[in-house]
């Protein structure tokens, strides 16, 4: 006869491990008992359980309520046991010793491997600002047994670097993603991908990139000269910029206060029916937490009664 077993039994933390030990013998042979032991390099052999053909299952007190026989129907030649709720400390070598009649004793050893799936965490780096050099965008850490694989999935151009720390029963892997921040990266996903044999599928954590920037400001609204004549209605100046965080807009007049009736609505300056009093230099001030920009325009309202005059447009930033 011979024992059918496995060299390695792999189980995920918290699951039940089946330690296989099946005696393949002649029809007239009987199994009297199967003794299970944990083989520890330091502590030697520690008894785990005994499956006895007459007495039944004995479980060592250290494994009380954790060792069972597989559910019926059971073959009398099957000495397999279930180790419930495997923990990391269960990892190691196990031995089954089968006493048969009349063939004698057989033994086999197997290794129990307990996979500890990682629970990854993603930590964003310091605030990203356009104009910075190579900067940490995010770091991702995952600890497990064996060591997990940590990579990045993104369309953003950058560099990744990994380091690992080995603990007695696990390994922690940290991967960092560095990039040169630009406004085109804003809102782009940066995904940490953790692979591990204890996971049915990769674990993914996505971080949305936020890059602080403020674009140059410009003013639109003076393109059509016919709008800027005395008596015309609906004339507006719009300040153009973009930024992250979204900027705030402020309008002022360089050569005095804003004329009465001129309304400020965020990035837009609205004029009442135009008079020559509305002529002047207007300044759009754009700002966010990162920076501020100015753009100024000179408005001259043309009086149709004075054909010699034309609208003069000067823009400066």
């Amino acid at each position: 006869g011979e024992l059918e077993t496995s060299d390695v039994v792999t189980v995920v933390l918290g699951q039940d491990a089946k330690l296989p030990c099946f005696y393949r013998g002649d029809p007239d042979e009987q199994v009297g008992q199967v003794a299970w032991a944990r083989v520890d390099p330091n502590e030697g052999i520690r008894e785990l359980a005994l499956l006895h053909s007459k007495y039944g299952l004995h479980v060592n007190p250290a494994y009380e309520d954790r060792v069972e026989q597989p559910p019926p129907p059971r073959d009398p030649l099957d000495g397999s046991v279930l180790l419930r709720n495997a923990v990391q400390a269960d990892e190691g070598e196990y031995e089954c010793r089968v006493s048969t009649f009349p063939a004698g004793s057989f033994q086999a050893r197997m290794r129990l491997r307990v996979l500890v799936p990682p629970l990854p965490s993603l930590n964003p780096g310091p605030p990203l600002e356009e104009g910075q050099g190579l900067t940490l965008a995010a770091s991702c850490t995952a600890e497990g047994s064996p060591a997990p694989s940590v990579t990045w999935d993104t369309e953003v151009k950058g560099t990744q670097s990994s380091r690992s720390f080995t603990h007695p029963r696990s390994a922690a892997v940290t991967s960092e993603f560095h990039l040169v921040p630009s406004r085109s990266m804003n809102g782009q996903p940066l995904t940490c991908v953790v692979s591990h044999p204890g996971l049915l599928q990769d674990r993914r954590i996505t971080h949305t990139l936020q890059v602080a920037f403020l674009a140059e400001a410009s003013v639109r609204g003076l393109e059509d000269q016919n709008l800027w004549q005395v008596g015309r209605e609906g004339a507006t100046l719009k300040c153009l910029s973009e930024g992250q965080p979204p900027p705030k807009y402020n309008w002022t007049r360089l050569d005095g206060p804003l004329p009465s009736g001129v309304r400020v609505k965020g990035d837009t300056l609205g004029f009442p029916p135009l008079t020559t009093e509305h002529s002047g230099v207007y300044v759009c001030h754009v700002s966010n937490e990162l920076s501020s920009r100015d753009s100024q325009v000179t408005v001259e309202v043309l009086d149709p009664e004075d054909p010699g005059k034309q609208v003069d447009l000067v823009s400066a930033s």
Epitope: G32, Q33, A35, E47, L50, H52, K54, Y55, G56, L57, H58, N60, P61, R97, S99, S105
Partner: antibody, heavy 126, light 107 residues
């Protein structure tokens, strides 16, 4: 025929010592674990101690741990129980018994006692 | 330690009666249970091992059953030589422990 014969019992004062012997015959002595079981007058059975076939492993009831020592001489087919610091509550008939040999190489469990000696009376009294 | 509780502690019966003695363990012991018979002034004698296996030479009127925590010794038809004290014993753990005994007396 399996035979177990105890000897060495008698009257001893509290704090005294006594050594019990059990001569075995009719079986391969070294192949069997052996036990001592006692029975106080008019009382039930109490397991005292056990020893593996080789003598390498010994086991004791808490009530006698540190005072009693079990041993065996396989060349003489004899089991011993050295009893020190005896107390009145140790008064009992002491039986040696053979453990049934149908569990092999597994020390965590004892086995039934299939053969017993006739017993020897130990009386601890001043 | 595992506690073994026998009931009844004594019983009176007549020759030919069916007698049942029960034994309860304080925790599960699979079938690691033996039954012994002891007559006055004599050593105990193994009757049943592994809860239900009859020891060689023991009359078939003795039988045992149970597993886990509850066990029974049955004498199907009591004979004059069966009047004695009966003990159950667990050997699942060290120390092995005995029940307090059941004395079977003549009615």
């Amino acid at each position: 025929e399996v035979q177990l014969v105890e000897s060495g019992g008698g009257l001893v004062q509290p704090g005294g010592s006594l050594r019990l012997s059990c001569a075995a015959s009719g079986f391969t002595f070294s192949s069997y674990a052996m036990s001592w079981v006692r029975q106080a007058p008019g009382k039930g059975l109490e397991w005292v101690s056990a020893i593996s076939g080789s003598g390498g492993s010994t086991y004791y009831a808490d009530s006698v741990k540190g005072r009693f020592t079990i041993s065996r001489d396989n060349s003489k087919n004899t089991l011993y129980l050295q009893m020190n610091s005896l107390r009145a509550e140790d008064t009992a008939v002491y039986y040696c018994a053979r453990e049934y040999s149908d569990v092999v190489d597994y020390v965590s469990v004892r086995t039934p006692l299939d053969y017993w000696g006739q017993g020897t009376l130990v009386t601890v009294s001043s | 330690d595992i506690q073994m509780t026998q009931s009844p502690s004594s019983l009176s019966a007549s020759v030919g009666d069916r007698v049942t003695i029960t034994c309860r363990a304080s925790q599960g012991i699979s079938s690691y249970l033996a039954w012994y018979q002891q007559k006055p002034g004599k050593a105990p004698k193994l009757l049943i091992y592994a809860a239900s296996s009859l020891q060689s030479g023991v009359p078939s009127r003795f039988s045992g059953s149970g597993s886990g925590t509850d066990f029974t010794l049955t004498i199907s038809s009591l004979q004059p030589e069966d009047f004695a004290t009966y003990y159950c014993q667990q050997h699942y753990t060290t120390p092995p422990t005995f029940g307090q005994g059941t004395k079977v007396e003549i009615k």
